[in-house]
């Protein structure tokens, strides 16, 4: 499987954001697919469960992104990819995207360093 | 050996309808999208739409009024069909595979068909 | 629409010269940049893909490289099938993708 991201984003506390992922594979796109969806901390702290899939969304129980994060992909399309509600600070960090679609479970992992900020860059508003 | 081949009708009424066929080899419609784009004379290229492996389809919010994909997987062939034609729709027409799959590039391009709409 | 502007619309350039295309997107379009051959004749090849993966059997005097809104194709070693027109295509968002005006490359 090789991976597609947004590799980096910048999003204003408060707001959403679509975390993208998209993938390619050997093997066609069938009930097989799993996605999985971790996030790593800036401070180093332990790795986080954020979402999963396969056939349907499972969304966390627990934690910082229940009721947070819902599926914004399409298998069809070899999208992967998340919506992250309400984005606090502590959001900041890495956000993981691994793909499998059996046979093809093997590849890079795909990553998305979010930084969450108070105010969107004047270059970011002059180019939206 | 991927190929792909546009056979359309060359010579178009105004306000009729434009049909063209493309028939692929070398590859399954079954696990590979399909686009459609189009080069007006002297201009660059604009996308159309794209049927994907599935069936479903995308298009340009700008002919989706008058634009419709369809395939038939087993005779290994898209269709492409655009209503209403004017002279600005006077183009080549080129179907591509959709590759990579979410890197979303088309890796293999059809020849083209030119398409000339006058009366 | 994502508006994706080639600024060059034509270059000359010499056997064996360097060559750099440029693209600018009108929004940050990760990555999801893709460049294309189109030869007098009409026929359009793939090049690079998400910015800077090579196409199969595309000769490796190809590259490309960008981030966020800026993106370029960069052809070493110029040879005589490289005079073309070339076209940068965004695939972030969907739909439309949409493409460049084209770049067209002479020889001096």
């Known amino acids: 499987v090789e991976i597609y991201t947004s590799r980096v984003l910048e999003a204003v506390n408060g707001t959403d954001a679509r975390l993208k992922c998209t993938f390619s594979s050997f093997a066609p796109v069938g009930d097989a697919l799993t996605v999985t969806w971790n996030f790593r901390p800036l401070d180093g702290g332990p790795e986080q469960f954020v979402f999963y899939y396969h056939i349907d969304p499972f969304q966390p129980m627990s934690g910082r992104f229940k009721d947070r994060v819902s599926w914004d992909g399409n298998p069809e399309r070899y999208d992967a990819s998340i919506l992250l509600w309400k984005l606090q600070f502590d959001d900041n960090g890495t956000y993981t995207c691994q793909v499998k679609n059996p046979p093809d479970v093997d590849g890079v992992i795909g990553e998305i360093r979010l930084s969450v900020v108070h105010t969107v860059r004047f270059s970011e508003i002059h180019f939206l | 050996e991927v190929q792909l081949k546009e056979s359309g009708p060359g010579l178009v009424q105004p306000s009729q309808s434009l049909s063209i066929t493309c028939t692929v080899s070398?590859?399954?419609?079954?696990?590979?999208?399909v686009h459609w784009v189009r080069q007006s004379p002297g201009k660059g290229l604009e996308w159309l739409g794209v049927i994907w492996s599935g069936g479903s389809t995308d298009y340009n919010a700008a002919f989706i009024s008058r634009l419709s994909i369809s395939k038939d997987n087993s005779k290994s062939q898209v269709f492409f069909k655009m209503n209403s034609l004017q002279a600005n729709d006077t183009a080549i027409y080129y179907c591509?595979?959709?590759?990579?799959?979410?890197?979303?590039?088309?890796?293999?391009w059809g020849q083209g068909t030119s398409v000339t709409v006058s009366s | 629409d994502i508006q994706m502007t080639q600024t060059t619309s034509s270059l000359s350039a010499s056997l064996g010269d360097r060559v750099t295309i440029s693209c600018r997107a009108s929004q940050d379009i990760s990555n999801y940049l893709n460049w294309y051959q189109q030869k007098p004749d009409g026929t359009v090849k793939l090049l690079i893909y998400y910015t800077s993966r090579l196409h199969s059997g595309v000769p490796s005097r190809f590259s490309g490289s960008g981030s966020r809104i800026d993106y370029s194709l960069t052809i070493s070693n110029l040879e005589q099938e490289d005079f073309a027109t070339y076209f940068c295509?965004?695939?972030?968002?969907?739909?439309?993708?949409?493409f460049g005006g084209g770049t067209k490359l002479e020889i001096k």
């Open positions: 070398g590859f399954s419609l079954t696990r590979y999208g």
């Open positions: 591509a595979r959709n590759g990579y799959d979410g890197g979303y590039a088309m890796d293999y």
């Open positions: 295509q965004q695939s972030d968002t969907l739909p439309p993708w949409t």
